[in-house]
């Protein structure tokens, strides 16, 4: 028996399910009674999921797996996981034993984009060029680890004086509070760009200085 | 060829500690989970402990948990075994196993003995 | 005791036919690979069978079966230098551990 899984790792967003694809090709003759499917953590050997002795053993990972039981006889043994979770990342070998075994690794990659960013300035009245002002940029409920990118009204990198922090909450999200100090000019906007690595996505926020009242 | 060679076998009194190693050759180590068997005089197999191929999951029979400890250095193709507060119910030929995919411990190297006495 | 049970003997003639059974659980040989080890006096385990398949090398007088939580190897045209120690061995994942059966010692009368 060979089993097939996909090269590409599969990017799913908290909160919603994937499917890890799995595939066999079975002889003919062939009945579930002869089949023994494992899903299990790679790193670990943790059993997710399972279908022996012709039934589906169930889920022993949180009760929020399920397997496809009417294309299991076309040889699909893929496993849905649901509500993902961050710490669900990783990878997934999918083992398949009927008169002789084979299996195959899936990873999956776990993704939640990031919200539009905040920008607040510190201080933030009585602003005269020539000042120091500290402008923080915020953004929330991200995953993995975004990437933080500051530019000035002219499209200008601004690298030197930022100092970027990330911080997990409860379930593995990330909050991301960026901030930049720098001198201001007569007047100047200031954006930051706020990108999710896996998802490719954007998030954008900017401040312009024009002496008074500021806008965001 | 696959082979693997134990050593650091000894005599050591009761309480003593003791490192084995295996030296793994002839197939990509670091790709592997590994594994450590003993056997009594006059007894069956017993599995003792096992590690991930990145070291990063360890598991223990309930008979040396806290008192040993499975290690790897995947750069040297070596897999160890720490033995600490021995006992004399640990006295027996330890041998080091290749654990593939499939759930198989399909390589094993040729032994080395402890024992532990006063 | 043994997670896995085997019996602790078993014996015949040469040519004839032996059969070496396991039995274990539904977290062990119910859905891991079962394996089955030969070791004959004063050397290491050698890997004889798992599940069904044969390692190269091993002659095809050695064949292997498992059907539920239980498994057996059978060997046919048995020969003297098949006495040895026989093991069955499976990962079980409710243990997070190997578990071995205590060993069926072949005697070739």
């Known amino acids: 028996v060979e089993v097939q899984v996909s090269e590409d790792p599969v990017v799913a967003l908290v909160d919603t399910d994937a499917t890890l694809r799995c595939s066999f090709s079975p002889e003919p003759g062939f009945s579930l009674a002869q089949l023994n499917l494992i899903w299990q953590l790679t790193d670990t050997k943790q059993l997710v999921h399972s279908f022996t002795e012709g039934r589906d053993q169930g889920s022993a990972y949180s009760n929020r797996t399920a397997l496809f039981p009417d294309l299991l006889v076309q040889g699909n043994a893929s496993l849905r996981l649901q509500r993902v979770r961050v710490t669900d990342e990783g990878s997934y070998t999918c083992f398949v034993s009927i008169q002789d075994f084979d299996s195959a690794a899936v990873s999956l990659q776990v993704a939640a984009p990031y919200s539009k960013p905040s920008m607040t300035l510190e201080p933030n009245k009585d602003l005269r060029p020539g000042n120091m002002v500290t402008i923080t940029c915020s953004s929330y409920q991200g995953y993995p680890e975004a990437e933080v990118f500051w530019k000035d009204g002219q499209g200008v990198p601004l690298t030197g004086n930022v100092t970027t922090s990330q911080m997990a909450n409860e379930r593995g999200l990330f909050d991301v509070h960026s901030v930049l100090r720098v001198v201001l000019g007569a007047n100047g906007t200031y954006s930051c760009l706020v990108r999710n690595p896996v998802l490719q996505q954007d998030a954008h926020g900017s401040v312009t200085i024009t002496g008074q009242p500021l806008t965001f | 060829e696959v082979q693997l060679l134990e050593s650091g076998g000894s005599l050591v009194q009761p309480g003593g500690s003791l490192r084995l190693s295996c030296a793994a050759s002839?197939?990509?180590?670091?790709?592997?989970?590994m594994s450590w068997v003993r056997q009594a005089p006059g007894k069956g197999l017993e599995w003792v402990s096992g590690i991930s191929s990145s070291g990063s999951a360890t598991y223990y029979a309930d008979s040396v948990k806290g008192r040993f400890t499975i290690s790897r250095d995947n750069s040297k193709n070596t897999l160890y075994l720490q033995m600490n507060s021995l006992r004399a119910e640990d006295t027996a030929v330890y041998y080091c196993?290749?654990?593939?995919?499939?759930?198989?411990?399909?390589?094993w190297g040729q032994g080395t003995t402890v024992t532990v006495s006063s | 005791q043994s997670v896995l049970t085997q019996p602790p003997s078993a014996s015949g003639t040469p040519g004839q036919r032996v059969t070496i059974s396991c039995s274990g659980s539904s977290s062990n040989i119910g859905r891991r690979t079962v394996n089955w080890y030969q070791q004959l006096p004063g050397t290491a385990p050698k890997l004889l069978i798992s599940n069904s398949q044969r390692p190269s090398g091993v002659p095809d007088r050695f064949s292997g079966s498992k059907s539920g939580t239980s498994a057996s190897l059978a060997i046919t045209g048995l020969q003297s230098e098949d006495e040895a120690d026989y093991y069955c061995a499976s990962w079980d994942d409710s243990l997070n551990a190997w578990v071995f059966g205590g060993g069926t010692k072949l005697t070739v009368l």
């Open positions: 196993a290749r654990w593939n995919d499939y759930d198989i411990m399909d390589v």
């Open positions: 002839g197939f990509t180590f670091s790709s592997y989970w």
